[in-house]
Amino acid sequence: EEELQVIQPEKSVSVAAGESATLNCTATSLIPVGPIQWFRGVGPGRELIYSQKEGHFPRVTPVSDPTKRNNMDFSIRISNITPADAGTYYCVKFRKGSPDVELKSGAGTELSVRAKPSAPVVSGPAVRATAEHTVSFTCESHGFSPRDITLKWFKNGNELSDFQTNVDPAGKSVSYSIRSTARVVLTRRDVHSQVICEVAHVTLQGDPLRGTANLSEAIRVPPFLEVTQQSMRADNQVNVTCQVTKFYPQRLQLTWLENGNVSRTEMASALPENKDGTYNWTSWLLVNVSAHRDDVKLTCQVEHDGQPAVNKSFSVKVSAHPKEQGSNTAAENTGTNERDYKDDDDKHHHHHH
């Protein structure tokens, strides 16, 4: 039979304080039968860290189920590492006996405990907000020691001052966490903006860690609506255009209504981006004037990003000029360009041109 070898593949393992350390160990044979024990250090003063056969080791978990058939993986995971756990760990195979007899040791794995902060994770608001509103961004970093740490916020490279930071716990601990919340006022130009959380710590040798978040995930820029009539064509058809401009995100549905009845519904897709990250979209409707005896009330209804619809109405005066007419001639343009999402009831907004 091939002679059993105990393999500890890593000479060293480095782990942040408070995290778990995995110490790998495999045997090359099922033979001989007998348990594995893990020790820290060598010689008579070595410390038993884990025994497969007996004992209570609350911080140590075998990576593989010891009862798994034909198990030759004797790796362990030590939870909640502290600087006191540093040292060299040995995986030792025993031969079954009365008592079990030490047979072979692995080469050892040196565990070093570092206390570097984790990469900052920046999270934004759960729902989008519009310009002029204030939104909160949170930055978190964990696992560092000592407790002293510096955190800064930037928006597009400019340092922010409106933030609150807490380092926990307040008392002594093997590792610490930092959580900071910054308040950012949105502007309509913020689609391409970015907030940065920067963490500086003694373990980082002057090279701070950064976490970023894009304001595009937090902002909603509502559209402007403008409805205009082009010159009447020779075939008595009027081309009415609804221009939807400066909106973000792209998710937008436009519905044309003729005298309150749905004429057409369109979804915005694959629109070119403006320099500021917003989108524009133009939709038009051809109205056959000769088919109508009375004025035609056209409504461009826009539902943006799941918000309440915004309406812009336009009346084509059929009786006034049965022949060709210029843009906006003998027409009533009703609506509003207000940018908040209230129901835009035409009865409340009459603008005669």
Partner: antibody
Framework: QVQLVQSGAEVKKPGASVKVSCKAS????????INWVRQAPGQGLEWIAM????????HYNQIFKDRATLTTDTSTSTAYMELRSLRSDDTAVYYC????????????WGRGTLVTVSS | DIVLTQSPDSLAVSLGERATINCRAS??????????IFWYQQKPGQPPKLLIY???NLDSGVPDRFSGSGSGTDFTLTISSLQAEDVAVYYC????????FGQGTKLEIK
């Protein structure tokens, strides 16, 4: 030192049930399978079933699947084997045995529990 | 299920002589380079005792006059020089699948 101490002898009537216990010591109970084996008088060994105390995973001999139930109590490191609907041919010594190498073998044995089924 | 058949059913051997017990499996008990055969010794009034694991490996504390050999479907337990304390019933067991035992071989002194 691994020890498996079994409960005392039982006399049961046909149709009754019996529950044999096996208390383990000298090792981490949840790290090793426990097997149950029986031996009728003057007969050979017959494997009944096995249980992993860490998660109560069990494997049964098809012959006993409908009548035997293995359980464990990890707080007391005790394994149990219950056999229902006893017949006279269930009269046997019932052994628990620990699998030290996870090879589905029987490295350490209890001393056995004699179950007699008689009307 | 794998069926194990031991031969002979009983065996009488003189003290100091070699005793050989065979165990044949109804299909191969080999897997991943190991032969999943185990040999047990049972003396009257005692539980069985593991002698050999994985076909050829002597268990802890077992005298080296005991040995196991074989692969695939045919296996042998050998006692090189029979001692009086070796009188017992010997069982083979497989665990390539779920455990099954052979019917046993009774070893006596001639």
């Amino acid at each position: 030192q691994v020890q498996l101490v079994q409960s005392g002898a039982e006399v049961k009537k046909p149709g009754a049930s019996v529950k044999v216990s096996c208390k383990a010591s000298g090792y981490t109970f949840t790290n090793y399978w426990i097997n149950w084996v029986r031996q009728a008088p003057g007969q050979g060994l017959e494997w009944i079933a096995m249980i992993d105390p860490s998660d109560s995973e069990t494997h049964y001999n098809q012959i006993f699947k409908d009548r035997a139930t293995l359980t464990t109590d990890t707080s007391t490191s005790t394994a149990y084997m219950e056999l229902r609907s006893l017949r006279s041919d269930d009269t046997a010594v019932y052994y628990c045995a620990m699998d030290y190498g996870s090879l589905y073998a029987m490295d350490y044995w209890g001393r056995g529990t004699l179950v007699t089924v008689s009307s | 299920d794998i069926v194990l058949t031991q031969s002979p059913d009983s065996l009488a051997v003189s003290l100091g002589e070699r005793a050989t017990i065979n165990c044949r499996a109804s299909k191969s008990v080999s897997s991943s380079g190991y032969n999943y055969i185990f040999w047990y010794q049972q003396k009257p009034g005692q539980p069985p005792k593991l002698l050999i694991y994985l076909a050829s490996n002597l268990d802890s504390g077992v005298p080296d006059r005991f040995s196991g050999s074989g692969s695939g479907t045919d296996f042998t337990l050998t006692i090189s020089s029979l001692q009086a304390e070796d009188v017992a019933v010997y069982y083979c067991q497989e665990s390539r699948e779920l455990p099954t035992f052979g019917q046993g071989t009774k070893l006596e002194i001639k």
